[in-house]
Interface confidence: medium
């Protein structure tokens, strides 16, 4: 197979440490202009499976503030604006990367961590278990 | 005042370069047991705003594979299983952190990047603009 040549301008890394620890540039390239989930859309209010956004805050993590969706109802909102319990509001989850300081109190040493967050809710047909 | 002492095991940093670059340990602490979005739930099929999951792959990014949701319909699925265009299927988006190799093809040098991904879809009441 074809191997992409290693860029000669790469920082050095000793095999014994690679790839456990890498250098990361903090000049974050942000492809998005709006980072506030409440501003980005009002889907959380207009959805047939509406949700509330709760602030999950941890000063020892980056990002320190993560918004977690909690579905407002067990059922879904029908055309009359009432909750229909024949349908279910369920959270849509996403696994995201965060950075946590490690070892503690080191200003420039971090570990990647994966956490599961609920981003919003969707309305699904329930799985019905029929008893014989 | 009292300063938290700097951990003696911290990586060194020269003031002129610090804090643009930090060390990140890639031994990811994963708080989740299930990482495959197709396995984690079948909501994408059971939703009234169903979606398909598309594989977005980039070897110069970590994680190299990200699953992107694309809503199947403009409308939502009604109780009869038909698409109701009086409602809208819309993507729920989440801003996530990724690592991008920089310079390209360097195995241990990255830049933090924020990208917006569609995680799933939800069914919303449309905003109707009335013409006078």
């Amino acid at each position: 197979g074809i191997t992409i040549p290693r860029n000669p301008g790469c920082p050095n890394s000793e095999d014994k440490n690679f790839p456990r620890t890498v250098m990361v540039n903090l000049n974050i390239h942000n492809r998005n202009t709006n980072t506030n989930p409440k501003r980005s859309s009002d889907y959380y209010n207009r959805s047939t499976s509406p949700w509330n956004l709760h602030r999950n805050e941890d000063p020892e993590r980056y990002p320190s503030v993560i918004w977690e969706a909690k579905c407002r109802h067990l059922g879904c909102i029908n055309a009359d604006g009432n909750v229909d319990y024949h349908m279910n509001s369920v959270p849509i989850q996403q696994e995201i990367l965060v950075l946590r300081r490690e070892p503690p109190h080191c200003p420039n040493s971090f570990r990647l961590e994966k956490i599961l967050v609920s981003v919003g809710c969707t309305c699904v047909t329930p799985i019905v278990h029929h008893v014989a | 005042g009292i300063t938290i002492p700097r951990n003696p095991g911290c990586p060194n940093s020269e003031d002129k370069n610090f804090p643009r670059t930090v060390m990140v340990n890639l031994n990811i602490h994963n708080r989740n047991t299930n990482t495959n979005p197709k396995r984690s739930s079948d909501y994408y099929n059971r939703s009234t705003s169903p979606w398909n999951l598309h594989r977005n792959e980039d070897p110069e990014r970590y994680p190299s594979v990200i699953w992107e949701a694309k809503c199947r319909h403009l409308g939502c699925i009604n109780a009869d299983g038909n698409v109701d265009y009086h409602m809208n299927s819309v993507p729920i988006q989440q801003e996530i952190l990724v690592l991008r190799r920089e310079p390209p093809h360097c195995p241990n040098s990255f830049r933090l990047e924020k990208i917006l991904v569609s995680v799933g879809c939800t069914c919303v009441t449309p905003i109707v603009h009335h013409v006078a």
């Epitope: 903090l26 974050i28 980072t35 602030r55 805050e57 000063p59 020892e60 993590r61 980056y62 990002p63 320190s64 503030v65 950075l99 946590r100 300081r101 200003p107 420039n108 971090f110 | 005042g1 009292i2 300063t3 610090f18 804090p19 930090v22």
Partner: nanobody, 119 residues
């Protein structure tokens, strides 16, 4: 939603003083380091001062040390910058910023307050 609102800027003569304030909301103010950063006309952003969550530790960029004092009131969710012996080169838009564990990386800024030092 995280909000930072600065005030207190204005026109001042060289050698004069100003006190900038920043009102914070939408996060647990007392848990985070806070910063003042500035942008002089036609220049890039420059870090000015940092204060740790308890207020007991402060850091300053070398050219403001001894002239500027950063402080905070966690009960009022407020950050301050006392600026004395102001110089023409201190002319800039001053922003307060919420700290993150990533050193000198800010996700949230205020809208800024303009400080003009001129005779």
């Amino acid at each position: 939603e995280v909000q930072l609102v600065e005030s207190g800027g204005g026109l001042v003569q060289p050698g004069g003083s100003l006190r900038l304030s920043c009102a914070a909301s939408g996060f647990t103010f007392s848990s985070y380091s806070m910063y003042w950063v500035r942008q002089a006309p036609g220049k890039g952003l420059e870090w000015v001062a940092e204060i740790k969550p308890t207020g007991s530790v402060q850091y300053y960029v070398s050219d403001v040390k001894g002239r500027f004092t950063i402080s905070r009131d966690n009960a009022k969710n407020s950050l301050y910058l006392q600026m004395n012996s102001l110089r023409a080169e201190d002319t800039a838009v001053y922003y307060c910023a919420k700290g993150e564990i990533l050193p000198l990386y800010f996700d949230y800024w205020g809208q800024g307050t303009l400080v003009t030092v001129s005779s």
